[in-house]
Interface confidence: medium
């Protein structure tokens, strides 16, 4: 789970070891702060749960691509 130390910096200390189907994801943000021990991606699910993931993993990259495309495609 994401952790806030001296908010507003949020860091990830552990990554999920399970994939999450892209349709369950609502958004993501990258964690690149030097105050954090590792770079990370935090996904927010459609039920507003936040999950830390490893940006080096293919499923994480696929998911970010998917969400990027979703935001670029206006809903009609």
């Amino acid at each position: 789970q994401p952790d806030a130390i001296n908010a507003p910096v949020t860091c990830c200390y552990n990554f999920t070891n399970r994939k999450i189907s892209v349709q369950r994801l609502a958004s993501y943000r990258r964690i690149t702060s030097s105050k954090c021990p590792k770079e990370a991606v935090i996904f927010k699910t459609i039920v507003a749960k936040e999950i830390c993931a490893d940006p080096k993993q293919k499923w994480v990259q696929d998911s970010m691509d998917h969400l990027d495309k979703q935001t670029q495609t206006p809903k009609t």
């Epitope: 994939k19 999450i20 189907s21 892209v22 349709q23 369950r24 293919k58 499923w59 990259q61 696929d62 998917h66």
Partner: antibody, heavy 122, light 107 residues
Framework: QVQLVESGGGLVQPGGSLRLSCAAS????????MSWVRQAPGKGLEWVSS??????????SYAASVKGRFTISRDNSKNTLYLQMNSLRAEDTAVYYC?????????????WGQGTLVTVSS | DIELTQPPSVSVAPGQTARISCSGD??????VYWYQQKPGQAPVLVIY???NRPSGIPERFSGSNSGNTATLTISGTQAEDEADYYC??????????FGGGTKLTVL
């Protein structure tokens, strides 16, 4: 343990119809996507169709070769997957396997049924 | 769809290492899965997510994937490993693409 049992195969004339069933047990059916994969005699594996899980509102997808002719569906109350095959052609002759998957779009098949043979011939 | 190419056949002596390749455009950016199929039987998943073995699959099976090529490696090949092997990847919306299959013969 996970079990997938196909049925409904048989001999059908070109232009005819057939409905395949796949009875699932040993897992929470609605939480998994399900697919049909076929294998023509002496040939390789060919993905036919998928129906996703509850997280994706059971979205469906089809191979170009069957789109408009085949319809995939599922009955979660019966733990059963279906494939309605219409306007059958000789090239649809194959063993049809049902298989389950968990994640999308990283679709891979961790359990398979033993298959049911569909023969399209006059 | 992603097009996957496998050699039709590979031969190996018992106890030796068998390598089966699967090539496709930028395949290294996708996960690759491998299945073993013996005559008259359904396929069995032997490798998932490039290099992971499902429980019950012997340690002699391993996988790798980078660039345009994924490889299934069987170390210390045994007679029971004689089978057809298929690689598989995915595109969008739960569609799957299979390679043409490779017949592994244990001499």
């Amino acid at each position: 343990q996970v079990q997938l049992v196909e049925s409904g195969g048989g001999l059908v004339q070109p232009g005819g119809s057939l409905r395949l069933s796949c009875a699932a047990s040993g897992f929470t059916f609605r939480s998994y996507g399900m697919s049909w994969v076929r294998q023509a005699p002496g040939k390789g594996l060919e993905w036919v169709s998928s129906i996703e899980h509850k997280w994706t509102n059971y979205a469906t997808s089809y191979a170009a070769s069957v789109k408009g002719r085949f319809t995939i569906s599922r009955d979660n109350s019966k733990n059963t997957l279906y494939l309605q095959m219409n306007s059958l052609r000789a090239e649809d002759t194959a063993v049809y396997y049902c298989a389950r998957f968990e994640f999308t779009p990283w679709t891979y098949f961790d359990f398979w049924g033993q298959g049911t043979l569909v023969t399209v011939s006059s | 769809d992603i097009e996957l190419t496998q050699p039709p056949s590979v031969s190996v002596a018992p106890g030796q290492t068998a390598r089966i390749s699967c090539s496709g455009d930028n395949l290294g950016k996708k996960y690759v899965y491998w299945y073993q199929q013996k005559p008259g039987q359904a396929p069995v998943l032997v490798i998932y997510d490039d290099d992971n073995r499902p429980s019950g699959i012997p340690e002699r099976f391993s996988g790798s994937n980078s660039g345009n090529t994924a490889t299934l490696t069987i170390s210390g090949t045994q007679a029971e490993d004689e089978a057809d092997y298929y690689c598989q990847s995915y595109t969008a919306q739960s569609s799957a693409s299979f390679g043409g299959g490779t017949k592994l013969t244990v001499l």
